[in-house]
């Protein structure tokens, strides 16, 4: 039913759900406290745009007793109960902020009329991607498939003069949510990536894998798997690896590798690790201060959700145009913001763009070192080192079939 | 439009050292490698070396490793190249060049040209 | 490093003649580069990934070729296409011109 909203007469609201089923463990005291800061920015920003106006946030906790597992399994309904209970209240904002996970998000997009946008930090998955009244702040499946299809297309870089066609990925079902959606979307037959490869078969017990990595009849040398290096050391240890064998370690969350004292462990010499670009240093503000690498885009994303609705909330004032129309629920969508760390630009379809990179382990120094960088916004490729000091042959990339022949 | 503007033409003495100047202007300077190659009279091309401007990472050809020093100023979106301990066959026309992946040298300054002579 | 040899190194061509210059790789590449360049002036990007051309090239140019033999071709000579033209390959480390064909008009 359509709910009242608080959005209009020189005040308005944000509601935020604090769902136990979240994409990222992160206490929810870290999420509000990022809220509130942004918060501070979009009244200051409105300010001195000499919008004389109240910006407020209301946090929708979920009871907890039934959805309790902490992850997103058990999400699916919880944000329908979250939704329920705003209804019930009658304390609906101008905008959702949540829920992360994809099947909740998935399934209040289905079930309800949504005349409102939502801002969801998370909800990776490919079955949200097209949604109209959508936002996503952390980069989405899609983004992902498509830097792969043209990395493996591409043939034209001294570092890589073999088009890929094959690949095997791992996915063992213990993923985190960002990704075991990434994963599910490399799996799924349907897919771009799987349209595009000739070759690809999941593995899913650590033993295949395993297996893979000295098969002389391994179908291909190509292994993409999604985690931190710990969880790759915890599956490949210290065992031996065939020479052409490349493995993508799709890592995106973790600005770890970009500090200056780290050092890259033995095992990762054979890895391309796939992560995003980092923003300028968090570590001053007062929400991130507690929070870990991997969990700082998580909180920034809570954070860059509130400037966005700041962002747009001024240009509809500014413009004389009311905020509860299907124009404004529309709107979150085609534009570059200022986000708490730089520019944030979103695709047609409400999508954050963002700047990946792939890291190389410098067989000189041990360090990790950009190979090259991908802008989502323009799926365009930037080389970075022409002559990357690789553990493959010749300082290239191998073939992702062994015995092919150049091309 | 786009423009690399490089310093103007030097002479200088053998065994001393120049640093020629590219000026990148109308597009994203820290986006695209910048290359630098060197034409002797009437002769080929050479690539020099390549530098990012925004990881700082520089790959040179082996037969310049020694001569040519390549440095950024993100600040001012200029590129540097350095040459040491001249002699007359340095003497050239030197070209800063950016990338634009795939296509690679898509822009060609105007040119220094060094004379290396006592 | 790939060493690239062009052929002819000098050659003439009167105005709508068909003019082709040839390119051979000492190994096999994937893709060739050319480039343009008039006296006094700096070299401009011609031809990129063997067959593209760059911008604001004549469609009378094309490019074309794989492994060790490319080739550039002109369709009509005319007047302002008197150049010199390099190759340029960047599929091994490091990338390496060819000695330039230097195309004069009759």
């Known amino acids: 039913s359509q709910v009242s909203q608080n959005c209009h007469n020189g005040s308005y609201e944000i509601s935020v759900l604090m769902m136990g089923n979240s994409a990222f463990a992160e206490p929810l005291k870290n999420l509000e406290d990022a809220v509130n800061e942004g918060l501070e920015i979009v009244r200051g920003r409105l300010q001195n745009a000499g919008l004389n106006v109240t910006v407020n946030a209301t946090f929708m906790y979920s009871d907890g007793l039934i959805h309790n597992s902490g992850d997103c399994r058990s999400s699916t309904c919880e944000g329908l109960d979250l939704l329920r209970k705003i209804s019930n209240a009658q304390r609906m904002g101008c905008v959702l902020i949540g829920p992360s996970c994809t099947y909740s998000t998935f399934q209040m997009y289905l079930d309800t009329e949504l005349s409102y946008p939502m801002i969801s930090a998370g909800s990776f998955g490919l079955s949200c991607d097209y949604k109209e009244t959508l936002t996503r702040l952390m980069s989405p499946a899609r983004k992902l498939m498509y830097f792969l299809v043209n990395f493996w297309k591409t043939n034209d870089l001294p570092f890589k003069t073999y088009s890929w066609s094959t690949s095997y990925v791992y996915k063992n079902g213990t993923e985190t949510e960002d990704c075991f959606w990434y994963l599910n979307a490399l799996e799924a037959s349907v897919s771009y990536f799987s349209h595009e490869l000739g070759f690809k078969v999941v593995l899913r017990q650590d033993k295949e894998f395993q297996d893979i990595l000295m098969d002389h009849n391994r179908k291909s040398n190509v292994i993409i798997m999604c985690g931190g290096p710990e969880f790759l050391y915890k599956l490949k240890g210290d065992r031996a690896v065939a020479e052409d064998i490349v493995i993508i370690l799709v890592d995106l969350f973790n600005d770890q590798y970009f500090e200056d004292n780290v050092t890259a462990p033995d095992y990762m010499k054979n890895v391309l690790v796939l992560t995003l670009s980092p923003g300028n240093s968090l570590l001053n503000s007062s929400f991130s201060r507690n929070l870990s690498p991997t969990k700082r885009d998580f909180a920034l994303a809570y954070l860059n959700g509130i400037l966005l609705f700041g962002h747009m909330l001024k240009i509809f004032l500014e413009n004389g145009e009311n905020i509860t129309t299907p124009k404004f629920a529309h709107a979150f969508r085609n534009l570059t913001f200022e986000g708490y760390d730089g520019p944030v630009t979103l695709d047609d379809w409400g999508d954050v763009d963002s700047t990946m990179v792939l890291l190389y382990t410098s067989v000189d120094t041990k360090k990790y070192k950009v190979l090259l960088t991908y802008d989502t916004h323009v799926n365009k490729t930037y080389p970075v080192d022409m002559s990357p000091t690789f553990t493959w042959k010749n300082s290239k990339l191998p073939n992702d079939i062994t015995g092919r022949g150049p091309q | 439009e786009f423009q690399l503007q490089q310093s103007g033409p030097e002479l200088v003495k053998p065994g001393a050292s120049v640093k020629i100047s590219c000026k990148a202007s109308?597009?994203?300077?820290?986006?695209?490698?910048m290359n630098w190659v060197k034409q002797s009279n009437g002769k080929s091309l050479e690539w020099i070396g390549v530098?990012?401007?925004?990881?700082?990472?520089?790959n040179y050809n082996q037969k310049f490793k020694d001569k040519a020093t390549l440095t950024v100023d993100q600040s001012s979106s200029t590129a540097y190249m350095q040459l040491n301990s001249l002699t007359s066959e340095d003497s050239a026309v030197y070209y800063c060049?950016?990338?634009?992946?795939?296509?690679?040298?898509?822009?060609w300054g105007q040119g220094t040209t060094l004379t290396v002579s006592s | 490093q790939i060493v690239l040899t062009q052929s002819p190194a000098i050659m003439s061509a009167s105005p709508g003649e068909k003019v082709t210059i040839s390119c051979s790789a000492s190994?096999?590449?994937?893709?060739m580069y050319w480039y343009q360049q008039k006296p006094g002036s700096s070299p401009k990007s011609w031809i990129y990934r063997t067959s593209n051309l760059a911008s604001g090239v004549s469609a009378r140019f094309s490019g074309s070729g794989s492994g060790t033999s490319y080739s550039l071709t002109i369709s009509s000579m005319e007047a302002e296409d008197a150049a010199t033209y390099y190759c340029?390959?960047?599929?091994?480390?490091?990338?390496?011109f060819g000695g330039g064909t230097k195309l004069e008009i009759k």
């Open positions: 530098m990012n401007p925004k990881f700082g990472t520089i």
């Open positions: 190994s096999s590449v994937n893709y």
């Open positions: 060049v950016r990338d634009d992946y795939p296509n690679y040298f898509d822009y």
């Open positions: 109308g597009y994203s300077f820290t986006d695209h490698n």
């Open positions: 340029q390959q960047y599929h091994d480390y490091p990338p390496t």
